[in-house]
Protein backbone atom coordinates (compact mmCIF):
# COMPACT_ATOMS: atom_id res chain seq x y z
CA UNK A 1 0.00 0.00 0.00
CA UNK A 2 2.82 2.41 0.95
CA UNK A 3 4.61 1.54 -2.29
CA UNK A 4 1.50 2.32 -4.36
CA UNK A 5 1.08 5.64 -2.51
CA UNK A 6 4.75 6.58 -3.02
CA UNK A 7 4.55 5.69 -6.70
CA UNK A 8 1.28 7.55 -7.20
CA UNK A 9 2.51 10.63 -5.35
CA UNK A 10 5.76 10.57 -7.31
CA UNK A 11 3.78 10.47 -10.55
CA UNK A 12 1.52 13.39 -9.52
CA UNK A 13 4.45 15.52 -8.27
CA UNK A 14 6.37 14.85 -11.52
CA UNK A 15 3.28 15.65 -13.58
CA UNK A 16 2.93 19.04 -11.86
CA UNK A 17 6.66 19.62 -12.25
CA UNK A 18 6.69 18.88 -15.98
CA UNK A 19 3.62 21.07 -16.51
CA UNK A 20 5.58 23.82 -14.74
CA UNK A 21 8.65 23.27 -16.93
CA UNK A 22 6.48 23.56 -20.05
CA UNK A 23 4.84 26.72 -18.66
CA UNK A 24 8.21 28.28 -17.79
CA UNK A 25 9.62 27.50 -21.25
CA UNK A 26 6.67 29.20 -22.93
CA UNK A 27 6.52 32.22 -20.61
CA UNK A 28 7.77 35.64 -21.73
CA UNK A 29 8.79 36.82 -18.26
CA UNK A 30 12.26 35.34 -17.93
CA UNK A 31 13.72 38.77 -17.27
CA UNK A 32 12.07 42.14 -16.73
CA UNK A 33 13.56 45.57 -17.22
CA UNK A 34 12.68 49.28 -17.26
CA UNK A 35 13.76 50.44 -20.71
CA UNK A 36 12.62 54.01 -20.53
CA UNK A 37 11.27 56.39 -17.91
CA UNK A 38 10.04 59.95 -17.91
CA UNK A 39 7.42 61.80 -15.83
CA UNK A 40 4.64 60.93 -18.29
CA UNK A 41 5.34 57.42 -19.55
CA UNK A 42 7.39 54.35 -18.70
CA UNK A 43 8.43 51.56 -21.03
CA UNK A 44 8.65 48.23 -19.30
CA UNK A 45 10.32 45.30 -21.02
CA UNK A 46 10.00 41.57 -20.41
CA UNK A 47 11.93 38.90 -22.24
CA UNK A 48 11.44 35.18 -22.72
CA UNK A 49 13.32 32.43 -24.52
CA UNK A 50 11.46 33.03 -27.77
CA UNK A 51 10.42 36.69 -27.85
CA UNK A 52 10.75 40.06 -26.19
CA UNK A 53 7.84 42.32 -25.28
CA UNK A 54 7.55 46.01 -24.44
CA UNK A 55 4.67 47.35 -22.39
CA UNK A 56 4.05 51.02 -21.85
CA UNK A 57 2.21 52.65 -18.97
CA UNK A 58 -0.33 53.82 -21.57
CA UNK A 59 -1.29 50.17 -22.10
CA UNK A 60 0.47 49.67 -25.44
CA UNK A 61 2.14 46.24 -25.70
CA UNK A 62 4.23 44.82 -28.53
CA UNK A 63 6.06 41.51 -28.71
CA UNK A 64 8.74 40.55 -31.21
CA UNK A 65 10.37 37.18 -31.84
CA UNK A 66 14.13 36.78 -31.79
CA UNK A 67 14.23 35.41 -35.34
CA UNK A 68 14.71 39.01 -36.48
CA UNK A 69 17.82 39.29 -34.33
CA UNK A 70 21.28 38.37 -35.54
CA UNK A 71 23.81 37.01 -33.09
CA UNK A 72 21.63 35.70 -30.29
CA UNK A 73 23.67 34.85 -27.19
CA UNK A 74 24.95 31.26 -27.40
CA UNK A 75 23.83 30.82 -23.80
CA UNK A 76 20.23 31.46 -24.86
CA UNK A 77 20.44 28.57 -27.34
CA UNK A 78 21.87 26.38 -24.59
CA UNK A 79 19.00 27.31 -22.24
CA UNK A 80 16.44 26.54 -24.97
CA UNK A 81 18.08 23.15 -25.56
CA UNK A 82 18.15 22.28 -21.84
CA UNK A 83 14.48 23.19 -21.37
CA UNK A 84 13.37 21.23 -24.46
CA UNK A 85 15.41 18.18 -23.42
CA UNK A 86 13.82 18.45 -19.98
CA UNK A 87 10.32 18.56 -21.46
CA UNK A 88 10.95 15.63 -23.84
CA UNK A 89 12.48 13.43 -21.13
CA UNK A 90 9.69 14.36 -18.74
CA UNK A 91 6.99 13.55 -21.29
CA UNK A 92 8.54 10.15 -22.04
CA UNK A 93 8.91 9.55 -18.31
CA UNK A 94 5.22 10.33 -17.76
CA UNK A 95 4.23 7.93 -20.54
CA UNK A 96 6.37 5.14 -19.09
CA UNK A 97 5.21 5.80 -15.53
CA UNK A 98 1.51 5.55 -16.49
CA UNK A 99 2.06 1.93 -17.52
CA UNK A 100 4.25 1.35 -14.47
CA UNK A 101 1.59 2.43 -11.97
CA UNK A 102 0.69 -0.43 -9.61
CA UNK A 103 -2.97 0.59 -9.57
CA UNK A 104 -3.24 0.13 -13.36
CA UNK A 105 -3.46 -3.45 -14.68
CA UNK A 106 -2.24 -4.06 -18.22
CA UNK A 107 -2.52 -7.67 -19.33
CA UNK A 108 -0.36 -10.00 -17.27
CA UNK A 109 2.48 -7.52 -16.62
CA UNK A 110 4.70 -8.80 -13.85
CA UNK A 111 5.76 -6.74 -10.84
CA UNK A 112 9.39 -6.97 -11.94
CA UNK A 113 8.50 -5.30 -15.28
CA UNK A 114 6.57 -2.58 -13.45
CA UNK A 115 9.53 -2.09 -11.10
CA UNK A 116 11.89 -1.62 -14.06
CA UNK A 117 9.50 0.84 -15.73
CA UNK A 118 9.11 2.77 -12.46
CA UNK A 119 12.89 3.03 -12.13
CA UNK A 120 13.25 4.13 -15.77
CA UNK A 121 10.61 6.85 -15.39
CA UNK A 122 12.14 7.92 -12.08
CA UNK A 123 15.56 8.39 -13.67
CA UNK A 124 13.95 10.29 -16.57
CA UNK A 125 12.18 12.63 -14.13
CA UNK A 126 15.41 13.24 -12.23
CA UNK A 127 17.31 14.12 -15.43
CA UNK A 128 14.36 16.23 -16.64
CA UNK A 129 14.31 18.19 -13.37
CA UNK A 130 18.07 18.70 -13.47
CA UNK A 131 17.85 19.96 -17.07
CA UNK A 132 15.20 22.52 -16.09
CA UNK A 133 17.12 23.69 -13.01
CA UNK A 134 20.33 23.92 -15.06
CA UNK A 135 18.58 25.84 -17.86
CA UNK A 136 17.04 28.39 -15.51
CA UNK A 137 20.30 28.79 -13.58
CA UNK A 138 22.34 29.30 -16.76
CA UNK A 139 19.86 31.99 -17.87
CA UNK A 140 19.99 33.75 -14.49
CA UNK A 141 23.79 33.68 -14.61
CA UNK A 142 23.78 35.03 -18.19
CA UNK A 143 21.49 37.85 -17.12
CA UNK A 144 23.62 38.89 -14.14
CA UNK A 145 26.85 38.64 -16.16
CA UNK A 146 25.50 40.66 -19.10
CA UNK A 147 24.13 43.43 -16.92
CA UNK A 148 27.31 43.72 -14.88
CA UNK A 149 29.43 43.78 -18.02
CA UNK A 150 27.39 46.49 -19.73
CA UNK A 151 28.05 49.21 -17.16
CA UNK A 152 27.49 52.80 -18.28
CA UNK A 153 29.87 53.76 -21.04
CA UNK A 154 29.87 56.18 -23.92
CA UNK A 155 31.75 55.98 -27.19
CA UNK A 156 31.64 57.59 -30.62
CA UNK A 157 30.00 55.53 -33.34
CA UNK A 158 29.49 56.06 -37.05
CA UNK A 159 26.24 57.96 -36.58
CA UNK A 160 27.33 59.97 -33.55
CA UNK A 161 27.48 59.09 -29.90
CA UNK A 162 26.51 55.71 -28.44
CA UNK A 163 25.70 55.39 -24.75
CA UNK A 164 24.85 52.27 -22.74
CA UNK A 165 21.96 53.10 -20.43
CA UNK A 166 21.89 51.77 -16.88
CA UNK A 167 18.43 50.33 -16.27
CA UNK A 168 16.93 48.34 -13.43
CA UNK A 169 16.39 44.66 -14.21
CA UNK A 170 14.89 41.82 -12.23
CA UNK A 171 14.55 38.06 -12.58
CA UNK A 172 11.21 37.27 -14.20
CA UNK A 173 8.48 35.03 -12.84
CA UNK A 174 9.45 32.28 -15.32
CA UNK A 175 12.79 31.77 -13.53
CA UNK A 176 11.06 31.02 -10.24
CA UNK A 177 8.45 28.82 -11.96
CA UNK A 178 11.31 26.93 -13.65
CA UNK A 179 13.27 26.43 -10.44
CA UNK A 180 10.23 25.20 -8.50
CA UNK A 181 9.01 22.99 -11.40
CA UNK A 182 12.47 21.48 -11.85
CA UNK A 183 12.65 20.77 -8.12
CA UNK A 184 9.22 19.11 -8.12
CA UNK A 185 10.14 16.92 -11.11
CA UNK A 186 13.36 15.95 -9.35
CA UNK A 187 11.50 15.06 -6.12
CA UNK A 188 8.91 13.09 -8.11
CA UNK A 189 11.69 11.16 -9.81
CA UNK A 190 13.32 10.30 -6.48
CA UNK A 191 9.95 9.09 -5.16
CA UNK A 192 9.52 6.86 -8.22
CA UNK A 193 12.97 5.38 -7.65
CA UNK A 194 12.11 4.71 -4.00
CA UNK A 195 8.80 3.10 -5.06
CA UNK A 196 10.71 0.87 -7.50
CA UNK A 197 12.55 -0.80 -4.61
CA UNK A 198 9.27 -1.76 -2.97
CA UNK A 199 7.80 -3.03 -6.23
CA UNK A 200 10.66 -5.39 -7.08
CA UNK A 201 9.84 -8.89 -5.70
CA UNK A 202 12.43 -10.67 -3.55
CA UNK A 203 13.15 -13.58 -5.92
CA UNK A 204 15.33 -16.61 -5.12
CA UNK A 205 17.96 -17.71 -7.58
CA UNK A 206 16.52 -21.22 -8.06
CA UNK A 207 13.19 -22.62 -9.21
CA UNK A 208 11.40 -25.27 -7.15
CA UNK A 209 10.85 -28.42 -9.19
CA UNK A 210 7.89 -30.69 -8.41
CA UNK A 211 7.90 -34.34 -9.31
CA UNK A 212 4.69 -36.17 -10.13
CA UNK A 213 4.09 -39.89 -10.35
CA UNK A 214 3.52 -41.19 -13.86
CA UNK A 215 -0.01 -42.09 -14.89
CA UNK A 216 0.99 -45.73 -15.58
CA UNK A 217 2.79 -46.66 -12.36
CA UNK A 218 1.51 -50.21 -11.99
CA UNK A 219 2.43 -53.28 -10.03
CA UNK A 220 2.27 -56.86 -11.35
CA UNK A 221 0.44 -59.48 -9.36
CA UNK A 222 0.11 -63.17 -10.04
CA UNK A 223 -2.91 -63.72 -12.17
CA UNK A 224 -1.77 -61.38 -14.88
CA UNK A 225 -4.14 -58.49 -14.15
CA UNK A 226 -3.19 -54.83 -13.67
CA UNK A 227 -3.59 -53.66 -10.10
CA UNK A 228 -4.29 -50.06 -9.17
CA UNK A 229 -1.78 -47.94 -7.35
CA UNK A 230 -4.45 -45.47 -6.31
CA UNK A 231 -6.49 -45.29 -3.15
CA UNK A 232 -9.80 -47.12 -2.73
CA UNK A 233 -11.23 -49.79 -4.92
CA UNK A 234 -10.45 -49.92 -8.57
CA UNK A 235 -12.14 -53.12 -9.66
CA UNK A 236 -12.24 -52.17 -13.31
CA UNK A 237 -8.48 -51.52 -13.46
CA UNK A 238 -9.08 -48.01 -14.78
CA UNK A 239 -6.36 -45.43 -14.73
CA UNK A 240 -6.81 -43.42 -11.56
CA UNK A 241 -4.28 -40.57 -12.08
CA UNK A 242 -3.60 -38.74 -15.29
CA UNK A 243 -0.75 -36.35 -14.92
CA UNK A 244 -2.08 -34.29 -17.83
CA UNK A 245 0.85 -34.92 -20.13
CA UNK A 246 0.24 -37.73 -22.57
CA UNK A 247 3.21 -40.03 -23.05
CA UNK A 248 4.10 -42.52 -25.73
CA UNK A 249 3.36 -45.56 -23.56
CA UNK A 250 -0.11 -44.25 -22.82
CA UNK A 251 -1.33 -45.80 -26.06
CA UNK A 252 -0.44 -49.32 -24.82
CA UNK A 253 -3.41 -51.27 -23.59
CA UNK A 254 -1.65 -54.18 -21.91
CA UNK A 255 1.34 -54.44 -19.65
CA UNK A 256 4.60 -55.02 -21.43
CA UNK A 257 8.21 -55.37 -20.55
CA UNK A 258 8.51 -51.60 -20.88
CA UNK A 259 6.19 -50.92 -17.94
CA UNK A 260 8.12 -50.06 -14.78
CA UNK A 261 7.11 -50.26 -11.17
Amino acid sequence: MAVTACQGLGFVVSLIGIAGIIAATCMDQWSTQDLYNNPVTAVFNYQGLWRSCVRESSGFTECRGYFTLLGLPAMLQAVRALMIVGIVLGAIGLLVSIFALKCIRIGSMEDSAKANMTLTSGIMFIVSGLCAIAGVSVFANMLVTNFWMSTANMYTGMGGMVQTVQTRYTFGAALFVGWVAGGLTLIGGVMMCIACRGLAPEETNYKAVSYHASGHSVAYKPGGFKASTGFGSNTKNKKIYDGGARTEDEVQSYPSKHDYV
Partner: nanobody, 120 residues
Framework: EVQVQESGGGLVQPGGSLRLSCAAS????????MGWYRQAPGSQRELVAT???????YYADSMKGRSTISRDNAKNTVYLQMNSLKPEDTAVYYC??????????????WGHGTQVTVSS
Protein backbone atom coordinates in the same frame (compact mmCIF):
# COMPACT_ATOMS: atom_id res chain seq x y z
CA GLU B 1 25.47 49.51 -35.51
CA VAL B 2 22.78 52.21 -35.68
CA GLN B 3 23.21 55.38 -37.71
CA VAL B 4 21.26 58.49 -36.65
CA GLN B 5 20.84 61.31 -39.14
CA GLU B 6 19.17 64.65 -38.37
CA SER B 7 17.95 67.20 -40.90
CA GLY B 8 15.77 70.31 -41.15
CA GLY B 9 17.79 72.80 -39.11
CA GLY B 10 18.62 76.30 -40.27
CA LEU B 11 18.08 79.99 -39.74
CA VAL B 12 14.57 81.15 -38.87
CA GLN B 13 13.04 84.46 -37.78
CA PRO B 14 11.45 84.83 -34.33
CA GLY B 15 7.84 83.60 -34.35
CA GLY B 16 8.64 81.35 -37.29
CA SER B 17 8.32 77.54 -37.64
CA LEU B 18 10.71 74.69 -38.37
CA ARG B 19 10.33 70.97 -38.87
CA LEU B 20 13.22 68.71 -37.82
CA SER B 21 13.54 65.13 -39.04
CA CYS B 22 15.59 62.26 -37.63
CA ALA B 23 16.04 58.86 -39.28
CA ALA B 24 17.56 55.79 -37.66
CA SER B 25 19.07 53.10 -39.87
CA UNK B 26 21.26 50.05 -39.51
CA UNK B 27 20.94 46.76 -37.67
CA UNK B 28 18.97 46.76 -34.43
CA UNK B 29 16.32 44.74 -32.63
CA UNK B 30 13.72 47.35 -31.69
CA UNK B 31 13.54 51.10 -31.13
CA UNK B 32 11.90 51.79 -27.78
CA UNK B 33 11.81 55.59 -27.87
CA MET B 34 13.05 58.49 -29.99
CA GLY B 35 13.49 62.07 -28.89
CA TRP B 36 15.03 65.47 -29.34
CA TYR B 37 17.51 67.20 -27.05
CA ARG B 38 19.15 70.58 -27.47
CA GLN B 39 22.36 72.22 -26.31
CA ALA B 40 22.84 75.95 -26.36
CA PRO B 41 26.40 77.35 -26.25
CA GLY B 42 27.75 77.11 -22.72
CA SER B 43 24.74 75.12 -21.46
CA GLN B 44 23.94 71.54 -20.58
CA ARG B 45 22.13 69.30 -23.03
CA GLU B 46 18.42 69.40 -22.21
CA LEU B 47 15.38 67.38 -23.25
CA VAL B 48 12.95 68.95 -25.73
CA ALA B 49 10.50 66.15 -26.47
CA THR B 50 10.32 62.35 -26.71
CA UNK B 51 7.96 59.78 -28.16
CA UNK B 52 7.77 56.09 -27.31
CA UNK B 53 7.05 53.20 -29.66
CA UNK B 54 3.43 53.21 -28.51
CA UNK B 55 3.06 56.92 -29.25
CA UNK B 56 3.26 58.33 -25.71
CA UNK B 57 4.78 61.80 -25.82
CA TYR B 58 6.59 63.98 -23.31
CA TYR B 59 7.52 67.66 -23.71
CA ALA B 60 9.84 69.88 -21.71
CA ASP B 61 8.10 72.84 -20.07
CA SER B 62 10.07 75.29 -22.25
CA MET B 63 8.58 73.79 -25.46
CA LYS B 64 5.13 72.76 -24.20
CA GLY B 65 2.39 74.06 -26.48
CA ARG B 66 4.90 75.23 -29.08
CA SER B 67 6.13 71.91 -30.40
CA THR B 68 4.70 68.60 -31.64
CA ILE B 69 6.66 65.38 -31.82
CA SER B 70 5.51 62.59 -34.14
CA ARG B 71 6.91 59.34 -35.33
CA ASP B 72 6.76 56.91 -38.24
CA ASN B 73 7.50 53.46 -36.80
CA ALA B 74 7.76 51.83 -40.23
CA LYS B 75 10.47 54.26 -41.35
CA ASN B 76 12.12 54.56 -37.91
CA THR B 77 11.81 58.31 -38.22
CA VAL B 78 10.87 61.01 -35.70
CA TYR B 79 9.72 64.56 -36.50
CA LEU B 80 9.71 67.68 -34.35
CA GLN B 81 7.45 70.51 -35.48
CA MET B 82 8.46 73.73 -33.70
CA ASN B 83 6.26 76.83 -33.83
CA SER B 84 6.47 80.37 -32.39
CA LEU B 85 10.25 80.11 -32.17
CA LYS B 86 12.14 82.48 -29.88
CA PRO B 87 15.80 83.57 -29.93
CA GLU B 88 16.37 81.46 -26.77
CA ASP B 89 15.48 78.36 -28.84
CA THR B 90 18.79 78.79 -30.66
CA ALA B 91 20.84 75.62 -30.08
CA VAL B 92 22.22 72.49 -31.63
CA TYR B 93 19.35 69.94 -31.71
CA TYR B 94 20.34 66.32 -31.21
CA CYS B 95 18.27 63.29 -32.04
CA UNK B 96 18.26 60.43 -29.52
CA UNK B 97 17.29 56.84 -30.32
CA UNK B 98 16.93 54.28 -27.55
CA UNK B 99 17.38 50.74 -28.84
CA UNK B 100 16.48 47.54 -27.01
CA UNK B 101 19.26 44.97 -26.87
CA UNK B 102 17.83 41.60 -25.73
CA UNK B 103 19.41 40.30 -22.50
CA UNK B 104 21.57 43.41 -22.25
CA UNK B 105 21.20 47.03 -21.20
CA UNK B 106 19.54 49.25 -23.84
CA UNK B 107 21.69 51.58 -25.93
CA UNK B 108 21.18 55.27 -26.63
CA UNK B 109 22.32 56.42 -30.06
CA TRP B 110 22.90 60.10 -30.76
CA GLY B 111 23.12 62.02 -34.00
CA HIS B 112 25.76 64.64 -34.74
CA GLY B 113 23.19 67.40 -34.29
CA THR B 114 21.56 70.03 -36.49
CA GLN B 115 21.94 73.76 -35.85
CA VAL B 116 18.80 75.86 -35.30
CA THR B 117 19.30 79.60 -35.17
CA VAL B 118 16.42 81.96 -34.33
CA SER B 119 17.43 85.47 -35.28
CA SER B 120 16.02 88.47 -37.05
Amino acid sequence: EVQVQESGGGLVQPGGSLRLSCAASGSFFRIVAMGWYRQAPGSQRELVATITRGGSTYYADSMKGRSTISRDNAKNTVYLQMNSLKPEDTAVYYCNVRVEVPFMQPNDYWGHGTQVTVSS
